[in-house]
Structure formats: C-alpha cells, structure tokens
C-alpha cells in the first residue's frame, strides 16, 4: 500500500538535487582557488542534514547553522552588491566587475541558486513531488529559511558603501516584502556601513523619469536613514549601455555612466 504523502502547493525538489549541489560545489572550488580545500562531500552532508527527516514547514535558521559554519568565506565587505527582482542583470554585472559580489557569487548562494528542495518528516527521503509554497503553505520551509539565513549573514558582513540593484519596471521598485526589503535592509550594520547606494534599473528605452523620486524609493531612504546609514540613488537609464561601460570604461561615450 503506498504511504500517504503530503501534497504541497509548490514544485517538488529539483531533480538530481544531491548531484547538482555536489557538482556545483566542486565546480565552485575549481573556479575559486581560495576555496580549493573545501570538502564538498562534507558540505553536502551538512546541507542535507538541515532538512532531511524534518517537517518541511518547521525548518528554522538553527537547522542551517552547521552549514553556515562554512559561510565564513571572505568576500570583501566593501564590494557587496545586493539586488531585488533583477537577479540576471546583477549577476551579469558581477561577471564583468569581478571584484564585486552578489550572494550567489558566494559558495552557499551558488550552491542553492534557482534550486528547490524539501524532505519529509521522519523519513530520509527527499520529496521530488511537491514542496511547500511560501504563500499557500508556510514560510518556514527549507528554501525560504535558507535564503533568509544566508541573506541575513551576507548583509551583516557588508561594510563601507553597499550597492543594491532595483528593478525600475516594477510597480514597487522597493518592496518591503522582498528578501532585500524584509531581511537585508534590516541587517546592514550601521557601525560598519556608511552608505547604501541604490541603482534603479530602467526598463523602457525612452524612460527618462527620475525613478529615484519614486515613493517606494523614498520609503527605502527613510528606513535606511532611520538606521543611521546614508542613502544615495542613481538612475541606470540604459542597462545594456551600463554593462557595456562596465566592460569598457575607457569608451568616450561612457562618461555619464556609473
């Protein structure tokens, strides 16, 4: 008789999840020789231990603490780029500007990027059928708690000038309910962080509005200022041109770009 299995509203664990995490870990240590001594099997064991045999709606940050012990990777604290709802451009940027880092450029972020995972209470099985959806099922699910934990630690590590890339095409350019708005903003350390600089990325080619005046950006400025951190904002009117100028800063047409 097939055992009853909880049906969740979200997609199940990414297929070949263990193999994917292990392969990504090995690849990461090859790309980043400063991590050459990391034992990826041990990393996978700690990752697995965070959610296997646990109820997927009852995951805590504590469950990820063994894995977080690996999170002491030394990313330069003044070279951190946060992002909200504009991941692809942020990653394209750090691929060119190699001395800046998003969370997904760190080992733990790289391992989990775009993956879904969950287990089942009291069994060692990984659930490939369905996993809890943050809204419809529960917020304390393995994926959400993981990103909340690593995002908090990433923000806590930041110093000096922290940059954040925001999507100017969305109705809420700054969304208080995003990971950036609900976790990272509140975990920047005022004694270490001098300025948060927002880069608002425009979508339309003819969009010349100053999106730094958007009410949600003003809301972000207010939150940041209350935390004794300075705030600045820049419009990136042409993201394609912006990336081109990061690649070739000597180009004479790039004077007005960041």
């Amino acid at each position: 008789v097939p055992r009853w299995r909880q049906q969740w509203s979200g997609p199940g664990t990414t297929k070949r999840f263990p193999e994917t995490v292990l392969a990504r870990c090995v690849k990461y240590t090859e790309i980043h020789p400063e991590m050459r001594h990391v034992d990826c099997q041990s990393v996978w064991d700690a990752f697995k231990g965070a959610f296997i045999s646990k109820h997927p709606c009852n995951i805590t940050e504590e469950d990820y603490q063994p894995l977080m012990k690996l999170g002491t990777q030394t990313v330069p604290c003044n070279k951190i780029l946060l992002w909200s709802r504009i991941k692809d451009l942020a990653h394209q940027f750090t691929q060119v500007q190699r001395d800046m880092f998003t969370l997904e450029d760190t080992l733990l972020g790289y391992l989990a990027d775009d993956l879904t995972w969950c287990g089942e209470f009291n069994t060692s099985k990984i659930n490939y059928q369905s996993c809890p959806d943050w809204r419809k099922d529960c917020s304390n699910n393995p994926v959400s708690v993981f990103w909340k934990t690593v995002s908090r630690r990433f923000a806590e590590a930041a110093c000096d000038v922290v940059h954040v890339m925001l999507n100017g095409s969305r109705s809420k350019i700054f969304d208080k309910n995003s990971t950036f708005g609900s976790v990272e903003v509140h975990n920047l350390q005022p004694e270490k962080v001098q300025t948060l600089e927002a880069w608002v990325i425009h979508g339309g080619r003819e969009d010349s509005r100053d999106l730094c005046q958007d009410p949600t950006i003003k809301e972000l400025e207010s939150i940041i200022s209350k935390r004794n951190i300075q705030f600045s904002c820049k419009n990136i009117y042409r993201p394609d041109k912006f990336l081109q100028c990061v690649k070739n800063p000597e180009d004479s047409s790039c004077t007005s770009e960041i």
Epitope: P33, R36, H37, K69, T72
Partner: antibody, heavy 118, light 111 residues
Framework: QVQLVESGGGLVKPGGSLRLSCAAS????????MSWIRQAPGKGLEWVAS????????YYADSVRGRFTISRDNAKNSLYLQMNSLRAEDTAVYYC???????????WGQGTLVTVSS | QSVLTQPPSASGTSGQRVTISCSGS????????VYWYQHLPGTAPKLLIY???QRPSGVPDRFSGSKSGNSASLAISGLRSEDEADYYC???????????FGSGTKVTVLG
Amino acid sequence: QVQLVESGGGLVKPGGSLRLSCAASGFTFSDDYMSWIRQAPGKGLEWVASVSSGRPTTYYADSVRGRFTISRDNAKNSLYLQMNSLRAEDTAVYYCAREGWSGEFTDWGQGTLVTVSS
Amino acid sequence: QSVLTQPPSASGTSGQRVTISCSGSSSNIGFHFVYWYQHLPGTAPKLLIYKNNQRPSGVPDRFSGSKSGNSASLAISGLRSEDEADYYCAAWDDSLSGYVFGSGTKVTVLG
C-alpha cells in the same frame, strides 16, 4: 622534477630582520599557490604564510601577521619571506612548499635554519 | 597547543596495523580536506594523503586515510621499520584563515 631550494637563513638578533628566498624549478611556478612552513627545535610543523597565484592574495598565521611578508616574483620563479621584528620563538627550520590543487603541500624544500638569539 | 589534536605517540610491531587519530572542529576538518604528512628527522616532510583519503603516486597502499565529521585518521598496515617517523595531520581553518597542523604523532616500530 620539482625542486625547491631555500636560502637566506642564519643567525640574527631579536628585533632584527631576515629575508628568505626559495628558488623553484620543474613546474609552472606562476600557476601554483606557494607557502612557508616552519618547525621550531623539538616542536611540530607550523604553517607560516601562503601566497596565491595570479593577482597575489596573501595569508598569514596569527603568530607572524604584521611582522612577516610573503611575496613572489613569477619572472624569477622565486618565493620570498621578509621577516621583521624577529623574536626568539621564530627560531626554526623554514620550509618552502608548493600547494596542490586541493590545498595539499605536494612538494617541499630541504629547509633553511633561522636562529634568533642575542 | 595545536588546533588539531593527535596522540603524541603510537607503536606497533613489524607487520602490524597502527592508526593515528586527528581531532578538530567544524571550522577545519569538518568542512575541509584533511592532509597527512610523514616527516623523518633531517629530511623534507612528505605528503602521504590528500583530500582525506587520496594517495599521491609513489605512496604505498599500506597508508590509508579516512574522515568522519570533525575527525580524521591515518592507518598504516603492514608496519615496516622505514615507517618510523613523525606523522602530521593538517587542514585549512576558516576561523583562522590559514592552515593548521596537528601536534604530530611519533610512530615507533617495535623490534
């Protein structure tokens, strides 16, 4: 075959300075991380410092940070350890070592003795 | 006081099996490869085991390494007189941002 030959050791007074060199051959020096490891008389091995390949990043043991500087000259296939403000407890045989791709010390020199004494 | 803990000595008769333990923490052995080195007085140390259990070419298969959690061990089977040496475990330590060695274990082959 891989060869690592240290030089520059000797007797120095406390507070003095010394510069160790390591001449490397038999491998593509610029591709590999390089390290210094020491062994004090009657004691165990102690890692001192490492330097990355490419744009060099340096790493130091707490016991030498701020006093010792590791550097490399890829054109000369040479590794260096500049030792300042030397103390009696820095007395040791200093080994130059090549790191493998998983962080292991694959090849070692024969070592050079540094004695810090008044 | 070493970050990695090894017994100061181990011994066995010729042909016996000797095991050396190496105990650390999650900041070193837990998430990082363990390496083992053999050091004979007056010579350069020699790599015996890397990546927990891998032997470089030329190292006899009498030497084997293993790792579990925050501990590792080196086993020498079929002990021979030429195995008399000091043995050191090592690993990267995240909290120190550097390598750490064990205090070393002197292996003696009894007559």
